[in-house]
């Protein structure tokens, strides 16, 4: 949760309440002034502080990869990065800045079309090869709508969930991601204790459905809190 | 015309629940993180839970932690507040808003009301001792 990573005061400090009267806030909300926390930098944006800690790509933002912050860190501990621009390395798309795709290592621009077959290229090819320079296809959601025209059924390559038909996620399998059922109740689920702990896994699974979250199996004792099974459980 | 419309609230004991529901159209809202935050009255509206454009990330206020759960349906554009245990403290009008996936994302970033591009126009939550 967000209380991890914040001390508990952040969240209580809000700024004041935006577009007009009390109880009938605007729906659009105009610019606003940047808010200054400790360390005066404009809507926490900073590469240094307050990293974001991530588990893949999707979750940080459109300018950013997820990964360890030092070369050859602990791959436990991943955050946020700012992207590669033109004519840095790269080991996959996701480092790349919208724009630009990794080719051979480099940062370089994108035309779409061309985009569009590396992409593909990469996908098939990542079922097979050295997987160091894998999930290149990873993510830059603007390109998801050109890339998909058709809601992805299960089994279907994707790129994030929206790519995938109703009650289907995008989820690791192997060294590619394809779309899969979303957790029904009673089946078991992932409950991840550190953040970025499931970037590792070959085999994802879904998070659970609608109105389910992701507990520890009530009967299920173990001596190891760490190997309890959890599964999807009503709220 | 983009709108977020809040259903759901009402008037309930404390040590009760409440389901409040989020339906955004005019736009797929698939890339934006969805949130709830809460004004009651004389107080600043503060951040309740949010969900990331993701699906796989949540965050919450410390004071609903392990009582309230945020989950959103993005096939229906929709995004729900599982709220149990409530408690007085709780009784507010909750609003659901919605914030783009930003280019740089930080810690804060879903807490700060400022982020938020568009809001609904609030369901009330009382909840009686």
């Known amino acids: 949760t967000l209380n991890s990573v914040l001390n508990s005061n952040a969240i209580k400090n809000l700024p004041p309440p935006l577009g007009g009267a009390a109880g009938h806030p605007g729906s659009a909300v105009s610019a606003a002034p940047g808010i200054l926390y400790p360390g005066g930098n404009k809507y926490q944006t900073i590469d240094n502080y307050q990293p974001y800690p991530c588990a893949e790509d999707e979750e940080c933002g459109t300018d950013e990869y997820c990964a360890s912050p030092t070369r050859g860190g602990d791959a436990g501990v991943q955050i946020c990065l700012a992207c590669r621009k033109r004519r840095k390395r790269c080991m996959r798309h996701a480092m790349c800045c919208p724009g630009n795709y990794c080719k051979n290592g480099i940062c370089v621009s994108s035309d779409q079309n061309h985009f569009r077959g590396e992409i593909e290229e990469t996908i098939t090819e990542s079922f097979g090869n050295d997987h160091s320079t894998l999930d290149g296809y990873s993510r830059r959601t603007t390109l998801s709508s050109k890339m998909y025209h058709t809601k992805g059924q299960e089994g279907s390559v994707c790129l994030r969930s929206s790519d995938c038909a109703s009650g289907l996620c995008c989820a690791r399998h192997f060294w590619s991601k394809i779309c899969k059922p979303v957790l029904k109740e009673g089946q078991v689920c992932t409950k991840h204790r550190r953040k970025g702990s499931h970037g590792l896994e070959i085999f994802q699974r879904c998070y659970c459905g609608e109105g389910l979250s992701c507990r520890i199996q009530k009967d299920h004792h173990q001596a190891s809190n760490s190997s309890r099974l959890h599964t999807c459980q009503r709220h | 015309e983009v709108q977020l419309v809040e259903s759901g609230g009402g008037s309930v004991q404390a040590g009760g629940s409440l389901r409040l529901s989020c339906t955004a159209s005019?736009?797929?809202?698939?890339?934006?993180?969805m949130a709830w935050f809460r004004q009651a009255p004389g107080k600043e509206r503060e951040f309740v839970a949010a969900?990331?454009?993701?699906?796989?990330?949540?965050h919450y206020a410390d004071s609903v932690e392990g009582r309230f759960t945020i989950s959103r349906d993005n096939a229906k554009n929709t995004a729900f507040m599982q709220m149990i245990s409530l408690k007085p403290e709780d009784t507010a009008v909750y609003y659901c808003?919605?914030?783009?996936?930003?280019?740089?994302?930080?810690?804060?970033?879903?807490?700060?009301?400022?982020?938020?591009?568009?809001w609904g126009q609030g369901t009330q939550v009382t909840v009686s001792s």
């Open positions: 808003a919605a914030a783009p996936r930003p280019k740089r994302v930080s810690v804060r970033y879903f807490s700060t009301s400022s982020n938020y591009d568009y």
């Open positions: 005019g736009r797929p809202f698939d890339n934006y993180a």
């Open positions: 969900i990331s454009w993701s699906l796989s990330r949540t």
